[in-house]
């Protein structure tokens, strides 16, 4: 495989990693889509300050993380630890809403207007953000 | 140029295989996801199949999951679309679609000029 | 999965003429449409993109408008070059962008 030294054009670097931030909506499975075809995943918040980082570049604005319970417990797509890790919930959330009246719960993460997190509907479309990491050695399959 | 050239097609029975290639020129390949597409005759474009640059994210039709394989040798720069147990409603040209990213906005920018598939017995 | 569908499937015109193509989503896709040109025994050119911009070396007898569901693809004065299938194209649901079914533009 081969290591990204460098962050792509129209990227963000920040502690040695790249950040992409979108400016219109997609729902969570697609915009974690979009992240993936960029080698890259939904963003990973693992601490306090790239939290703060993140939610400098979104502004006030709905938007996806790569956090989500579609199959039960919570998940951050990367495969970090959400039990141990960091979290930054509003009050009384993750709350698993169902009344909003689109069929199901809430099962996807998003950065609220304030930067705290809430869950929400994953067909909701919401702005979203990409992160990968530099110095990874990317994942090239071998040829069958 | 920006060019991409397909090969591999041709007649093949139901349930037989075959694999197209896609070779790249003129742009940075390992920077860019790429796609396939395929028209059966007379018809409209169907999305096949989408890998990322680095090949380490694929994604399928539901029409051709399990039974098609999408890859790419970046040392080549080339793409691979690998089809088992064909069927005759696999018949189609097959094109190679370069993954354009304008902002948010995705389209396939770059084509090749396609490779016919015949499922026949 | 999102359905795209075009109107008219066929329709003919001259040279000169202004010509306008629809399409629709079976959803809202925001501005996530693309359109096609394609030519016969030739691969689809790929005119518009984000449903208003013009794709580079297109000619700005080409524009795109609309929102939601509902799109329009317009030609302001037909070239003869222009005689042609369109095909329009969600790219809201990353990868699988679906296309509408066409829409052939033949001389009158």
């Known amino acids: 495989g081969s290591e990204r030294t460098c962050c792509p054009v129209n990227w963000v670097e920040h502690e040695r990693s790249c950040y992409w931030f979108s400016r219109s909506g997609k729902a969570w499975a697609d915009a974690d889509n979009y992240c993936r075809l960029e080698d890259a995943h939904l963003v990973v918040v693992t601490s306090w300050e790239e939290q703060k980082f993140v939610q400098h570049h979104i502004g006030p604005v709905n938007t996806w993380m790569g956090l989500h319970d579609q199959n039960g417990p919570w998940k951050w797509v990367d495969g970090t630890d959400y039990e141990t890790g960091f979290k930054n919930w509003r009050p009384e959330q993750p709350d698993d809403w169902y009344g909003h009246g689109l069929g199901g719960g809430e099962d996807c993460a998003h950065f609220t207007d304030d930067g705290r997190w809430n869950d929400d509907v994953c067909q909701r479309p919401y702005r979203w953000v990409c992160e990968t990491e530099l110095d990874k050695a990317s994942q090239e399959p071998p040829l069958l | 140029e920006v060019q991409l050239l397909e090969s591999g097609g041709g007649l093949v029975q139901p349930g037989g295989s075959l694999r197209l290639s896609c070779a790249a020129s003129?742009?940075?390949?390992?920077?860019?996801?790429m796609n396939w597409v395929r028209q059966a005759p007379g018809k409209g474009l169907e999305w096949v199949s989408a890998?990322?640059?680095?090949?380490?994210?694929?994604f399928y039709a539901d029409s051709v999951k399990g039974r098609f394989t999408i890859s790419r040798d970046n040392s080549k720069n080339t793409l691979y679309l690998q089809m088992n147990s064909l069927r005759a409603e696999d018949t189609a040209v097959y094109y190679c679609?370069?993954?354009?990213?304008?902002?948010?906005?995705?389209?396939?920018?770059?084509w090749g000029q396609g490779t016919m598939v015949t499922v026949s017995s | 999965d999102i359905q795209m569908t075009q109107s008219p499937s066929s329709l003919s015109a001259s040279v000169g003429d202004r010509v306008t193509i629809t399409c629709r989503a079976s959803?809202?896709?925001?501005?996530?449409l693309n359109w096609y040109q394609q030519k016969p025994g030739k691969a689809p050119k790929l005119l518009i993109y984000?449903?208003?911009s013009l794709q580079s070396g297109v000619p700005s007898r080409f524009s795109g408008s609309g929102s939601g569901t509902d799109f329009t693809l317009t030609i302001s004065s037909l070239q003869p070059e222009d005689f042609a299938t369109y095909y329009c194209?969600?790219?809201?649901?990353?990868?699988?962008?679906?296309f509408g079914q066409g829409t052939k533009l033949e001389i009158k």
């Open positions: 679609a370069k993954r354009g990213v304008y902002g948010d906005y995705e389209a396939f920018d770059i």
């Open positions: 003129g742009f940075t390949f390992s920077s860019y996801a």
């Open positions: 890998i990322s640059g680095s090949g380490g994210n694929t």
């Open positions: 959803q809202s896709i925001i501005s996530y």
């Open positions: 984000g449903a208003s």
């Open positions: 194209q969600q790219s809201y649901s990353t990868p699988m962008f679906s």
